[in-house]
C-alpha cells in the first residue's frame, strides 16, 4: 500500500490558526493521511517523523516573541498535546528589518484519528513561499 | 538493492557556489545515489527526506543577508526549483564575533536523473567541518 | 522485528553532561536501541537518522557562547566522534530576556555498540520541557 | 587598489561637533564594517566603535557613547563620524578602518584626520 | 572590556639582531581554536599596518622575518633580524569582544 506521507507548503491565505496549508500545488504531496482545516489526520497508528518549518520576517524589529508549535489533537483527550516548539525571544537588532526560521522534526507515536496542526504566535510576521514555510510527516 | 542514502560533509576547497562536498571521508556516505559537481543525482524516482545544515561565522558582523536554499535542476525544466531556504537578516550586534547555523529538512518526490544542489550567499562566511556543514537525503 | 527507534526528552534533573533524558513517559519512547547514562547505544548495525533539538533562554543575555554537540564513543576509538554541532555566538542584545533553539540532523552509519550522546556547553541556560529540548533516530 | 581616504584636518572650539568622513573605494563597500579608532598627540590608539556598512547601525565604546554618532551612505561609499561637545581631549587623529567580516582584523586604514580642540 | 598590556614600554635592539614583544591579556581572548590577537606596526606619520592576525597568521605582503605566537591571554610578537625600517610602535590588540582594546604600545629603538 502507499506510504502515509505529507508535506505541506505555506498557504498566504493563511487567516488564523492553526496555519492553512496548500496540499496539491508545486512541491506540495499527500499520500495515506488526510488533510483537514490545517490538520494532518492520521490514517494508521504508527511511528512518524513529524516536521515543521516556519519563516518569520519583518520590517522593523521590535523583538516580539515568536512562538512555533507542532501540536496534537484526539477526540479522546480534552486538552492538546504539544509534540514540539520554539519560542525566539530578543533575536534582532531594534527597528531594523530582519528574517529567520524556525524548524523542528522529531519522531512520535501516532494513533490513528490523531490531528495534527501548526500553530504560530504571529501570523503577520511569516512569508508563506513553498520554500521557506512548510509542513510534513511520513511513516517510518 | 541497497538503499538510497547520502550524507555529504563540508569541504574546504569549495570555491564557488553551488557549493561541493566530501562524499569519501570522515563521516561522508553515498549509496545508490551519485555525486556529480557538487549535485546529488537521483537514481531512482520516489519520495526522498534531503536535509542540509550550513553553519556560518564571521568575526566583525555586518549583518550581510545570508541565504541557504537547496534547489533541484533536471534538464526538462528550464530553470531551478528550490526546494528549501531560509534567509537571514539582522541577526548579531554589530561589530561583535558571530556563529549561528541554518537547518533545512523535508520530503519531496524527486524524479530519476534530478540534481540537488545546496547554494548559499557568503562562501567566505561558511565552516565547512564535517560536524557543522553537511547536505543529505535518503529514500523513504 | 520491532524497528530500531527512540525519541528521549528533556530530564530537568540533569547536573552533568553528557545530558540525561527521559525514556518512559510522555511523549518518549525507546525500542531496539538502548538507553543509558545519557546515551542511546545501538544495537544493530546500520544507517540511521539522528536528531536533537535543544532549548536555550536565559534572564539576562550575556552572549555566552552556546554549544550544542551529538557525539559518538565506541570502545574501539579512544576519542569521541563528533557527529553533528552547532555552535552560537553573539546571538542576543545583552541585559535582555532571550531565549532560542539549536536544531541538529543527519543520517549516520553506525555499528553495534556505538553510544550516542549529546553534549552543551551551558547546562543552566536549558529549559527541559519535553516539546522543547529532545534527542532521538530512527533506523533507515 | 583598495583605498580609505578621509577628510581633512579640522580645527574646532571646545563645545561645538566634528563629522569626519571615509571614503572607500576598490572594494565592495559594503562587504566589510567600518572601524573608528583615535591616538592623541604622543598616545597609544583608542577604539571607538563600529558601524554595519550593510545595516547602518553601530556599536559604540562606553567611554563615546552619546557623543560618538556613526553612519553610512551607501550610494557614495562613504562613512561619517561624528563626536559632538568638543573638549581639548579630543584633540587626535582620528583614523576609519575597514574589517572583513570573514577575516580576524582591520587590514586597511584610513591616512587619518587631525581634529585640534582649542579655544 | 579586556585590559591589553605591553612589555616592554621600550626596547632598545641593534640590527640583525632579535626582537621579542609581548602582550598579555587580562583575560582569554580565544574562542572555538583561534586567537583573537592582532598586532599592528605604525611609524610616525602614518596610520598602523596590520602585521599579524588571529596570533599566528602572517597578512600578505609582510615580510617572513615577522612571526606571532601565542594563546589564551598570553602572546608574543617575534622579528627575527632587525632591518632598519622595523624601528617603530608596535600595538597588540583584541577583537575577541567590544570594545576592541590596544596595549599601550611598545617603542622598538635602535641600540
Known amino acids: 500500500e502507499p506510504r502515509s506521507v505529507a508535506h505541506l507548503t505555506g498557504n498566504p491565505h493563511s487567516r488564523s490558526i492553526p496555519l492553512e496549508w496548500e496540499d496539491t500545488y508545486g512541491t506540495a504531496l499527500i499520500s495515506g493521511v488526510k488533510y483537514k482545516k490545517g490538520g494532518l489526520v492520521i490514517n494508521e497508528t504508527g511511528l512518524y517523523f513529524v516536521y515543521s518549518k516556519v519563516y518569520f520576517r519583518g520590517q522593523s524589529c521590535n523583538n516580539q516573541p515568536l512562538n512555533h508549535k507542532v501540536y496534537m489533537r484526539n477526540s479522546k483527550y480534552p486538552e492538546d498535546l504539544v509534540l514540539m516548539e520554539e519560542k525566539r525571544l530578543n533575536y534582532c537588532t531594534t527597528g531594523q528589518i530582519w528574517a529567520h526560521s524556525s524548524y523542528l522534526g522529531a519522531v512520535f507515536n501516532l494513533t490513528s484519528a490523531d490531528h495534527l496542526y501548526v500553530n504560530i504566535s504571529q501570523l503577520s510576521l511569516i512569508n508563506f513561499e513553498e520554500s521557506k514555510t512548510f509542513f510534513g510527516l511520513y511513516k517510518l | 538493492e541497497p538503499r538510497s542514502v547520502a550524507h555529504l560533509t563540508g569541504n574546504p576547497h569549495s570555491r564557488s557556489i553551488p557549493l561541493e562536498w566530501e562524499d569519501t571521508y570522515g563521516t561522508a556516505l553515498i549509496s545508490g545515489v551519485k555525486y556529480k559537481k557538487g549535485g546529488l543525482v537521483i537514481n531512482e524516482t520516489g519520495l526522498y527526506f534531503v536535509y542540509s545544515k550550513v553553519y556560518f561565522r564571521g568575526q566583525s558582523c555586518n549583518n550581510q543577508p545570508l541565504n541557504h536554499k537547496v534547489y533541484m535542476r533536471n534538464s526538462k525544466y528550464p530553470e531551478d526549483l528550490v526546494l528549501m531556504e531560509e534567509k537571514r537578516l539582522n541577526y548579531c550586534t554589530t561589530g561583535q564575533i558571530w556563529a549561528h547555523s541554518s537547518y533545512l529538512g523535508a520530503v519531496f518526490n524527486l524524479t530519476s536523473a534530478d540534481h540537488l544542489y545546496v547554494n548559499i550567499s557568503q562562501l567566505s562566511l561558511i565552516n565547512f567541518e564535517e560536524s557543522k556543514t553537511f547536505f543529505g537525503l535518503y529514500k523513504l | 522485528e520491532p524497528r530500531s527507534v527512540a525519541h528521549l526528552t528533556g530530564n530537568p534533573h540533569s547536573r552533568s553532561i553528557p545530558l540525561e533524558w527521559e525514556d518512559t513517559y510522555g511523549t518518549a519512547l525507546i525500542s531496539g536501541v538502548k538507553y543509558k547514562k545519557g546515551g542511546l547505544v545501538i544495537n544493530e548495525t546500520g544507517l540511521y537518522f539522528v536528531y536533537s533539538k535543544v532549548y536555550f533562554r536565559g534572564q539576562s543575555c550575556n552572549n555566552q557562547p552556546l554549544n550544542h554537540k551529538v557525539y559518538m564513543r565506541n570502545s574501539k576509538y579512544p576519542e569521541d566522534l563528533v557527529l553533528m554541532e552547532e555552535k552560537r555566538l553573539n546571538y542576543c542584545t545583552t541585559g535582555q530576556i532571550w531565549a532560542h533553539s539549536s536544531y541538529l540532523g543527519a543520517v549516520f552509519n553506525l555499528t553495534s555498540a556505538d553510544h550516542l550522546y549529546v553534549n552543551i556547553s551551558q547546562l543552566s541556560l536549558i529549559n527541559f520541557e519535553e516539546s522543547k529540548t529532545f534527542f532521538g533516530l530512527y533506523k533507515l | 587598489q583598495v583605498q580609505l581616504v578621509q577628510s581633512g584636518a579640522e580645527v574646532k572650539k571646545p563645545g561645538a561637533s566634528v563629522k569626519v568622513s571615509c571614503k572607500g573605494s576598490g572594494y565592495t563597500f559594503t562587504d566589510y564594517t567600518i572601524h573608528w579608532v583615535r591616538q592623541a598627540p604622543g598616545q597609544g590608539l583608542e577604539w571607538m566603535g563600529v558601524?554595519?556598512?550593510?545595516?547602518?547601525?553601530?556599536s559604540y565604546n562606553q567611554k563615546f557613547k552619546g557623543r560618538a554618532t556613526m553612519t553610512v551612505d551607501k550610494s557614495t561609499s562613504t562613512a561619517y563620524m561624528e563626536l559632538s561637545s568638543l573638549r581639548s581631549e579630543d584633540t587626535a587623529v582620528y583614523y576609519c578602518?575597514?574589517?572583513?567580516?570573514?577575516?580576524?582584523?582591520?587590514?586597511?586604514w584610513g591616512q587619518g584626520t587631525l581634529v585640534t580642540v582649542s579655544s | 572590556e579586556i585590559v591589553m598590556t605591553q612589555s616592554p614600554a621600550t626596547l632598545s635592539v641593534s640590527p640583525g639582531e632579535r626582537a621579542t614583544l609581548s602582550c598579555k591579556a587580562s583575560q582569554s581572548v580565544d574562542y572555538d581554536g583561534d586567537s583573537y590577537m592582532n598586532w599592528y606596526q605604525q611609524k610616525p606619520g602614518q596610520p598602523p599596518r596590520l602585521l599579524i592576525y588571529a596570533a599566528s597568521n602572517l597578512e600578505s605582503g609582510i615580510p617572513a622575518r615577522f612571526s606571532g605566537s601565542g594563546s589564551g591571554t598570553e602572546f608574543t610578537l617575534t622579528i627575527s633580524s632587525l632591518q632598519s625600517e622595523d624601528f617603530a610602535v608596535y600595538y597588540c590588540?583584541?577583537?575577541?569582544?567590544?570594545?576592541?582594546?590596544f596595549g599601550q604600545g611598545t617603542k622598538l629603538e635602535i641600540k
Open positions: 578602518a575597514r574589517f572583513p567580516d570573514w577575516d580576524y582584523a582591520m587590514d586597511y
Open positions: 558601524i554595519s556598512t550593510y545595516q547602518g547601525d553601530a
Open positions: 590588540q583584541q577583537s575577541r569582544e567590544l570594545p576592541y582594546t
